[in-house]
């Protein structure tokens, strides 16, 4: 085969008991993994890395640590209070030679607004990133540095899916060899030019993202240059040809009827597990209508749930999902009317998603009450609105200027929301806490790794 066909990075995704606790069921956790992988797959597939195209991702294996594994001594992620560097290290202490990358998803509130951490790839002489094999390091431990971690929690709030997807793409971007974006060309969101600024920053921006600006889910030219060099050198080491579905990864892919994982994971009476012979694995057992692995509208008794059963909770912007009686998938929910308030009155619904700012309800657009504009620091975590394309009219929702719409009531950003022009995140006390993009790196310098590794870890 030609190297051009080796374009798929196979992933091992683990989730800890806190991630499971938040999402509640194995099926919901698998749906989260699937949506994250699909999101980065779309981003990377549509990026031309200096002639290297169609880079894709496939889940090779998953491990879901449930709340039952919280006390299991073989579960390295069982500890309740671990910092982000230690959490990444626990992942790296496992052997991940069978995978391009190995990630752990968690629901932990790490210090200083950190949403993820990963080892940075380099074209040569590197320890870390894609395809890196397990080896002995100076602290006397074997480690796999083809690793990263992400969390879905920030300052006590859960980040929106689009932000979490970009976090995953960002951390994987480090693994692929990209450092943080810097310089005017690659950080347009910091520009004084309004036309450039409004498109926002790229995936590898060092600080905060809202996920809804044009550039937020694209790689900058700086990232593309770095990633293409690493892909050129490294992808032949572990990337595979895309194609066949992977039976046993818990995700029902094209060509599979169901997928309940391997025999040690499969709790499903409906589906043949991945350890079965070729003709049977990932197929429905005889006489079974469906498998819960196909979706939430299938019972544990392998039958479609009845028409009236709920399969998705009502949310701010969408009505509850109701099974239709003839598929295991949960049908799309009806959207609530556009401009319905959501996310505690800080945003509005657009086409069933909590996507717009509350400002849009009144023909305004959201702006940052940024200290560089001479605004009071106390306003950095207020929702602020301005007239379209007119930053000179940026004012807090609590200001007299917008009192006709908000009646003088200050609407504050949710904890974990970007603030001060994406330099930081709001904490629970409504203070804008600047993101120290290289904090964990600095702490690791004092930890167990030898000096040659210092440059190769990043948020």
């Amino acid at each position: 085969t030609t190297s051009a066909e080796k374009n798929t990075c196979q992933l091992y995704i683990q989730t800890d008991h806190l991630f499971f606790k938040y999402y509640g069921t194995r099926e919901a956790v698998i749906a989260q993994i699937s949506s994250h992988v699909k999101a980065i797959d779309t981003i990377y597939q549509t990026t031309d890395f200096s002639g290297i195209r169609n880079i894709s991702f496939m889940v090779k294996r998953i491990r879901i640590n449930t709340t039952a594994d919280e006390k299991d001594p073989t579960n390295p992620f069982r500890f309740p209070n671990i910092g982000v560097e230690k959490f990444l290290e626990l992942n790296s202490e496992q052997n991940h030679d069978d995978y391009c990358l190995a990630y752990v998803f968690t629901d932990r509130d790490f210090d200083d607004g950190v949403l993820g951490l990963a080892w940075v790839g380099a074209p040569s002489g590197s320890s870390g990133g894609i395809c890196e094999k397990s080896k002995l390091y100076s602290d006397g431990k074997k480690k796999s540095l083809n690793t990263g971690i992400i969390t879905v929690q920030n300052y006590g709030s859960h980040v929106p899916p689009k932000v979490s997807h970009i976090t995953f793409a960002h951390e994987v971007g480090h693994n692929f060899g990209s450092p943080h974006d810097s310089g005017t060309e690659c950080t347009p969101g910091e520009s004084k030019n309004l036309g450039q600024k409004e498109n926002g920053n790229y995936i590898m921006y060092a600080r905060a993202t809202s996920g809804d600006k044009l550039n937020n889910n694209k790689f900058s030219l700086c990232s593309i240059r770095n990633i293409s060099q690493v892909l050129e050198k490294k992808r032949n080491n572990c990337f595979v040809e895309s194609g066949q579905p992977i039976c046993g990864n818990g995700m029902v892919e094209q060509g599979e009827e169901c997928d309940c994982g391997y025999s040690d994971q499969c709790k499903d009476e409906c589906c043949f597990d991945a350890n079965q012979p070729e003709g049977r694995k990932c197929k429905l057992k005889p006489g079974k209508q469906c498998s819960p692995s196909q979706g939430p509208c299938c019972t544990a008794q392998c039958a479609f749930k009845s028409k009236s059963e709920k399969c998705r909770d009502d949310s701010d912007c969408a009505r509850e999902g109701i099974c239709n009686g003839f598929t295991a998938l949960c049908p799309a929910s009806d959207p609530k009317p556009n401009f319905t308030d959501c996310n505690r009155h800080t945003q509005v619904c657009i086409n069933g998603q909590c996507a717009g700012s509350i400002c849009e309800k009144y023909g305004l657009e959201e702006c940052t009450c940024a200290s560089s504009d001479g605004k009071d620091d106390k306003e950095l975590c207020h929702v602020c609105c301005m007239k379209k394309m007119d930053p000179s009219t940026c004012a807090s929702t609590g200001s007299v200027q917008w009192s006709r719409h908000f009646s003088g009531r200050t609407i504050t950003l949710q904890p974990g929301s970007p603030c001060n022009d994406f330099r930081g995140y709001c904490d629970v006390f409504m203070r804008c806490r600047l993101v120290d993009a290289d904090g964990p790196l600095a702490r690791l310098k004092k930890a167990i790794f030898s000096p040659e590794l210092y440059e190769n870890i990043a948020e």
Partner: nanobody
């Protein structure tokens, strides 16, 4: 097309009164806030008072509170500024401005402006 025409300015002795009018046309009067602003020679334009036409809520600069009163006649699409106990420091060109979204005394927030009327207070 939005049009604002001020009238009622003139020369008055300190302690006297004037009533300024702002006649509006070309827009749905009820949807807007109307503000009065003034600019003295060599100084920045400053907000004096404003009114939200739909609900009648008003706002005043500290320097004119208790002396100036803003009101509107929705049938005539006109906003008035009654100025009592005038002082020499009230001397300026007085402008009215209108905006569909904003309110308050920051001139940056107002999209539509009249030509202004001169008020001179002699001591």
């Amino acid at each position: 097309e939005v049009q604002l025409v001020e009238s009622g300015g003139g020369l008055v002795q300190a302690g006297g009164s004037l009533r300024l009018s702002c006649a509006a046309s070309g827009f749905t009067f009820d949807d807007y806030a109307i503000g009065w602003f003034r600019q003295a020679p060599g100084k920045e334009r400053e907000g004096v008072s404003c009114i939200s036409v739909s609900d009648g809520s008003t706002y005043y600069a500290d320097s004119v509170k208790g002396r100036f009163t803003i009101s509107s006649d929705n049938a005539k699409n006109t906003v008035y500024l009654q100025m009592n106990s005038l002082k020499p420091e009230d001397t300026a060109v007085y402008y009215c401005a209108a905006d569909r979204l904003a309110y308050g005394l920051d001139p940056n927030f107002y999209d539509h402006w009249g030509q202004g009327t001169q008020v001179t207070v002699s001591s």
